[in-house]
Interface confidence: low
């Protein structure tokens, strides 16, 4: 054992494990209430009977699942990020909307548009948005594919956002792209519909630039014959935001003590 | 007791500022020796007189400077990363080497090749490599440019590694790309010369794919008339590795206590 | 953040990063490190008051979690948050070596 | 790493992550969180022996810095290293809300 006479400086003390657990439990009590900015547990008087609605459970599961491309909790957290974030999601505009008509012919891209009024309903102020993720359910993929995500800019130009190297896979898998900055822009602007494009990565000398990966909500052909959306699993934006009523309490971290 | 009744949980203790500083200073004494795996300060008997060699100072400054695209110290650090890392650098093979001949004609790319025998001299075993950065000195840039880095694969195919959006700038700036995995591969293989390609990002529908950014060590034309290398500032690999003699001490973190 | 910008210009009594410059020669009696001559090591110090118990008023305490006990620890402690490495130059025999020491410089602290 | 894999399967006396499951109903007396019913909060506990002084034997001590005092702190402390968030479902009036609470689950600890 490394301990010896010269271990004068050891801080070892007998620790009451149960006491520490109790303290931790009581601390968690305060922590959760504090993160939610509640002075006490909310009343349960108006809770409707029966199980949780399907949509709420689906949203809960989306939040709980760690998906490919999503990193663990970032660190260090800014003061504002200490507080709980309300989680909402906004589904992609369905593909029979006329906005898609002019973008149907490409073999190297798929397009995803979102209604900004739905985004604003979920997040009234851009500053409240803490994180926005674009989530796509990728289906089976036979070969490795390098894809790129673009944001729609004015008059049909596209701005590069990020890329991902997708490994071959026999099972469906959720992909997540951090699009916080883009969604914050959208919330600040007056547009009604905004969108993304997922494209095959094109190298300057490459010949075959076909997008091989299948994203749930689009047919495999992607040559105009867009399929019906498969339930709730079409692309969506997962939003984490400070609720408006909680936001007024946030102070600048410089003067917080 | 002077404390009011409701202050049971205060952790107030008298702290002697000077004692804390002294303890910290003594801890740093142990920490540095420990990180270097030295039982005592090394003898200075054989140190040559005069100032430090230029190359050593240049290397020291490369290590000290935070450069664009390089993140701060990653966290959490694996156990092996606790220990000091020897820093070396390997310059790009000069452009009059015949390896460059077949890659001279492109307007959208520049090529950088490295001698793997120099890499192996610096890092004898792939497992010793802790970090490898490709560092490029970019000169003035008039327009925003989206560039991509590729690794040379067998028979002149190229594998995408990463990308960077370069903002316009009036002053030169060091760029850094993390290429640890690639260099580890090179150290494992038998090849003599290995290389990277820096290319303009090509979107599938884009027409102008010219690489606008000037990298020190190449002429602005980049159409075959490669310039002489400007001193030590041509592209190089900055390597951080555990010295061979220190490596034998590293143990698996599972059994470390 | 409890970083050098805030802590060095304030009179913060609680957990904060504190200034400490180590001169290798004066403080450690070392001549063998050729570069740098010293460095701003800094350290974390200050209480992270334990601020929750059953008999504590809710309203008084909740706002303080963010500062003093964000991790709801049973015994919150003032520790480094952001650290930076330190490169040094020294000799082994006749051979100069540049080595990088990770996590040597404390840039900010937190109650954890 | 002093993570759940190592700490939960060992009898480590020094700093390690310790198991703690919080059942919202049993431990906190709460019925208002609908999902999850509880979660593995865990916590950090164990000494980080202070292992440097002028009269300490070099050889015995140097190897221990990595474990007990990697930051060369004057008073190293056992604190969370990796944390994970916790999403919950609860109601505000009739409206169910999903919220994410950051840094709620301790996955690993470190002496800092």
């Amino acid at each position: 054992d490394y301990k010896d006479d010269d271990d004068k400086l050891s801080t070892s003390k007998t620790i009451d494990m149960e006491l520490v657990k109790r303290k931790r439990i009581e601390a968690i009590r305060g922590q959760i209430l504090s993160k939610l900015r509640l002075a006490s547990p909310p009343s349960q008087g108006e809770v409707p009977p029966g199980p949780l609605p399907e949509a709420v459970l689906a949203l809960y599961n989306s939040t709980r699942d760690r998906v490919a491309g999503e990193s663990a909790e970032p660190e260090p957290e800014p003061e504002a990020d200490y507080y709980a974030k309300e989680v909402t999601r906004v589904l992609m505009v369905e593909t029979h909307n006329e906005i898609y008509d002019k973008f149907k012919q490409s073999t190297h891209s798929i397009y995803m548009f979102f209604n900004t009024s739905e985004l604003r309903e979920a997040v009234p102020e851009p500053v409240l948005l803490s994180r926005a993720e674009l989530r796509l359910l990728r289906l089976k993929l036979k070969v490795e594919q390098h894809v790129e995500l673009y944001q729609k800019y004015s008059n049909n130009s596209w701005r590069y956002l990020s890329n991902r190297l997708l490994a071959p896979s026999d099972s469906p898998e959720w992909l997540s792209f951090d699009v916080t900055g883009v969604v914050r822009q959208w919330l600040s602007r007056g547009g009604e519909i905004e969108g993304f494009r997922l494209s095959a990565h094109c190298s300057c000398d490459s010949k075959d630039n076909t997008l091989q990966v299948d994203i749930n909500g689009f047919t495999t052909g992607r040559r105009g014959d867009l399929a019906t959306i498969h339930g709730m699993n079409r692309p969506f934006l997962l939003l984490m935001a400070t609720p408006l009523e909680r936001a007024q309490h946030l102070q600048s971290s410089r003067h917080r003590r | 007791d002077y404390k009011d009744d409701d202050d049971k949980l205060s952790t107030s203790k008298t702290i002697d500022m000077e004692l804390v500083k002294r303890k910290r200073i003594e801890a740093i004494r142990g920490q540095i020796l420990s990180k270097l795996r030295l039982a005592s300060p090394p003898s200075q008997g054989e140190v040559p007189p005069g100032p430090l060699p230029e190359a050593v100072l240049a290397l020291y400054n490369s290590t000290r400077d935070r450069v664009a695209g390089e993140s701060a110290e990653p966290e959490p650090e694996p156990e092996a990363d606790y220990y000091a890392k020897e820093v070396t650098r390997v310059l790009m093979v000069e452009t009059h080497n015949e390896i460059y001949d077949k890659f001279k004609q492109s307007t959208h790319s520049i090529y950088m090749f490295f001698n793997t025998s120099e890499l192996r001299e610096a890092v004898p075993e792939p497992v010793l490599l802790s970090r490898a950065e490709l560092r490029l000195l970019r000169l003035k840039l008039k327009v925003e440019q989206h560039v991509e880095l590729y690794q040379k694969y067998s028979n002149n195919s190229w594998r995408y590694l990463s990308n960077r959006l370069l903002a316009p700038s009036d002053s030169p700036e060091w760029l850094s790309f993390d290429v640890t995995g690639v260099v580890r591969q090179w150290l494992s293989r038998g090849g003599e010369i290995e290389g990277f390609r820096l290319s303009a990002h090509c979107s599938c529908d884009s027409k102008d794919n010219t690489l606008q950014v000037d990298i020190n060590g190449f002429t602005t034309g980049r159409r075959g008339d490669l310039a002489t290398i400007h001193g030590m500032n041509r592209p190089f690999l900055l390597l951080m590795a555990t010295p061979l003699e220190r490596a034998q001490h590293l143990q698996s973190s599972r059994h470390r206590r | 953040a409890l970083d050098t910008n805030y802590c060095f210009s304030s009179t913060e009594k609680n957990c904060c990063v504190r200034q400490l410059y180590i001169d290798f020669r004066k403080d450690l009696g070392w001549k063998w490190i050729h570069e740098p001559k010293g460095y701003h090591a800094n350290f974390c110090l200050g209480p992270c008051p334990y601020i929750w118990s059953l008999d504590t008023q809710y309203s008084k305490v909740l706002a303080l979690y963010n500062q003093h006990n964000p991790g709801a620890s049973a015994a919150p402690c003032c520790v480094p948050q952001a650290l930076e490495p330190l490169p040094i130059v020294y000799y082994v025999g006749r051979k100069p070596k540049v080595e990088q020491l990770s996590n040597m410089i404390v840039r900010s602290c937190k109650c954890s | 790493a002093l993570d759940t894999n190592y700490c939960f399967s060992s009898t480590e006396k020094n700093c390690c992550v310790r198991q703690l499951y919080i059942d919202f109903r049993k431990d906190l007396g709460w019925k208002w969180i609908h999902e999850p019913k509880g979660y593995h909060a865990n916590f950090c506990l164990g000494p980080c022996p202070y292992i440097w002084s002028l009269d300490t034997q070099y050889s015995k001590v140097l190897a221990l810095y990595n474990q007990h005092n990697p930051g060369a702190s004057a008073a190293p402390c056992c604190v969370p290293q990796a944390l994970e968030p916790l999403p919950i479902v609860y109601y505000v009036g009739r409206k169910p809300k999903v919220e994410q609470l950051s840094n709620m689950i301790v996955r690993s600890c470190k002496c800092s």
Partner: antibody
């Protein structure tokens, strides 16, 4: 710029109560420790007590029975409630911002108000 | 309770003089001692804390020394604006926040 303004002083009869206020501005009040100190006419300074950000208070032994310190962070105001006043409580009452690098420096008075005079007389 | 004894209670000095004021604690307070200056009709002003650390903005002619029970405030070259009353204060914990009785520095 840090400003502390005491109010509520005046002439009061022995045995009566008085509440002094201290309005703070120019710093983040809710995050600072605050002290009350008094100075009888022509005499030295006497520390009354201190209140931490959370509401925890420390008071001099002589002040514990009759004097209560409180704060309202939403109003950036510190209070001193004085009960059963006596002639010897006549003094200028100062509020001061506590300042300390560490725990034990809570009681270094970094910034002071101009004071308010309390006269206890029948 | 701790007692703080300041001496002298008053002194007369001329501009340019070196002035020394002492403060003695009835038990050890390490270096947890502050010095304040007070002019008539004004609140006190912090000069020195931690026995020897000069408060920001205070002229360097003021200095403090000592630890344990014996402390000294020195003004190396007295200036016209330095005529005032000086107080020491111990603060090692909440029941030892005690001021000395003051030293009045007058013009000779």
């Amino acid at each position: 710029q840090v400003q502390l303004v005491e109010s509520g002083g005046g002439v009061v009869q022995p045995g009566r109560s008085l509440r002094l206020s201290c309005a703070a501005s120019g710093f983040h009040f809710s995050s600072e420790a605050m002290n009350w100190i008094r100075q009888p006419p022509g005499k030295g300074l006497e520390w009354i007590g201190y209140i931490y950000t959370s509401g925890t208070t420390y008071r001099a032994n002589w002040a514990r029975g009759r004097f209560t310190i409180s704060r309202d962070n939403s109003k950036n105001t510190l209070y001193l409630q004085m009960n059963s006043l006596r002639a010897e409580d006549t003094a200028v009452y100062y509020c001061a911002r506590g300042w300390h690098i560490f725990d034990h420096h809570y009681w270094v008075m970094h910034a002071w108000g101009q004071g308010t005079l309390v006269t206890v007389s029948s | 309770d701790i007692q703080m004894t300041q001496s002298p209670s008053s002194l007369s000095a001329s501009v340019g003089d070196r002035v020394t004021i002492t403060c003695q604690a009835s038990q050890s307070i390490s270096t947890y001692l502050a010095w304040y200056q007070q002019k008539p009709g004004q609140p006190p002003k912090l000069l020195i804390y931690a026995a020897s650390t000069l408060e920001y903005g205070v002229p360097s002619r003021f200095s403090g020394s000592g630890s344990g029970t014996d402390f000294t405030l020195t003004i190396s070259s007295l200036q016209p604006e330095d005529f005032a009353t000086y107080y020491c204060q111990s603060y090692s914990d909440g029941d030892s926040v005690i001021f000395g009785q003051g030293t009045k520095v007058e013009i000779k």
